[in-house]
Amino acid sequence: VLEVYYTHLRCRCVQESSVFIPRRFIDRIQISPRGNGCPRKEIIVWKKNKSVVCVDPQAEWIQRIMEMLRKKSSSTPPVPVFKRKIP
């Protein structure tokens, strides 16, 4: 699941990790664009063991996953509101 949130009013990530997380262990990804009280883009990953980690948006591996998700979502009909279900 890829989620884009524009509603929060502050940064939520205190610390960011660039450590690789394989796709198979990722449950969903939340992207908070820059603005609305936070000066930077934030990427929050929920893992399948229920733990949560903030990922450095510059990490090469997360960029690859995001690109894959974008390609998938552009080839399927849009889902309403802010969520996209991606297998």
Partner: antibody, heavy 123, light 106 residues
Framework: EVQLVESGGGLVKPGGSLKLSCAAS????????MSWVRQTPEKRLEWVAT????????YYPDNVKGRFTISRDNAKNNLYLQMSHLKSEDTAMYYC????????????????WGQGTSVTVSS | DIQMTQSPSSLSASLGGKVTITCKAS??????ITWYQHKPGKGPRLLIH???TLQPGIPSRFSGSGSGRDYSFSISNLEPEDIATYYC????????FGGGTKLEIK
């Protein structure tokens, strides 16, 4: 040469507990995630558990969650699987495997396996 | 959960011949599939990862292909040491193995 040697299998009664061990050598154990996989008497392979290189992240399928616990001791190069509330359907050959995912360009899943240790759950 | 349907469950072929095994996933697994060879008394041996990448030391007689939900694995120029059971594994969403294919030589 990568070597994984499992031990600790045996016969246990339903509801009982057992702890499996896997001794690793031939690679930097602390740099790799590790998994347990079992082969049922019907020869089906089933993933049982995975633990990250540092041991902070663990993953389980629903059928063992809450009953099995994977752990590791990086100082001793050992991997463990604590099994409790055992059921007859847990009867299997249990393998430990190295789980190699260095980066998105180097994701091999389970690349080296041990020879297994047999667990029989029966009254 | 992703299901992996592997077929056939067993097959018999002649030395020097070619065999193909297929695995169909219940959803797109984005090429995250490996193939293993398993012989009695040993642990499975990784042959191919990420659909088609051969592991070091594995002969080029072994090959894999596929995308989306459909994947295949082939062995050409069959040799006696190829007698084994072969399994696919999806690792796109946790892990699921196929049911296995037992290969025998005629």
């Amino acid at each position: 040469e990568v070597q994984l040697v499992e031990s600790g299998g045996g016969l246990v009664k339903p509801g009982g507990s057992l702890k499996l061990s896997c001794a690793a050598s031939g690679f930097t154990f602390s740099s790799y995630a590790m998994s347990w996989v079992r082969q049922t008497p019907e020869k089906r392979l089933e993933w049982v558990a995975t633990i990250s290189d540092g041991g902070s992240d663990t993953y389980y399928p629903d059928n063992v969650k809450g009953r099995f616990t994977i752990s590791r001791d990086n100082a001793k190069n050992n991997l463990y699987l604590q099994m409790s509330h055992l059921k007859s359907e847990d009867t299997a050959m249990y393998y430990c495997a190295r789980d190699y995912y260095g980066s998105s360009y180097e994701d091999y899943a389970m690349d080296y396996w041990g020879q297994g240790t047999s667990v029989t759950v029966s009254s | 959960d992703i299901q992996m349907t592997q077929s056939p469950s067993s097959l018999s072929a002649s030395l020097g011949g070619k065999v193909t095994i297929t695995c169909k996933a219940s959803q797109d697994i984005n090429k995250y599939i490996t193939w293993y060879q398993h012989k009695p008394g040993k642990g499975p041996r990784l042959l191919i990862h990420y659909t088609s990448t051969l592991q070091p030391g594995i002969p080029s007689r072994f090959s894999g292909s596929g995308s989306g939900r459909d994947y295949s694995f082939s062995i050409s120029n069959l040799e006696p040491e190829d007698i084994a059971t072969y399994y696919c594994l999806q690792y796109d969403n946790l892990y699921t193995f196929g049911g296995g294919t037992k290969l025998e030589i005629k």
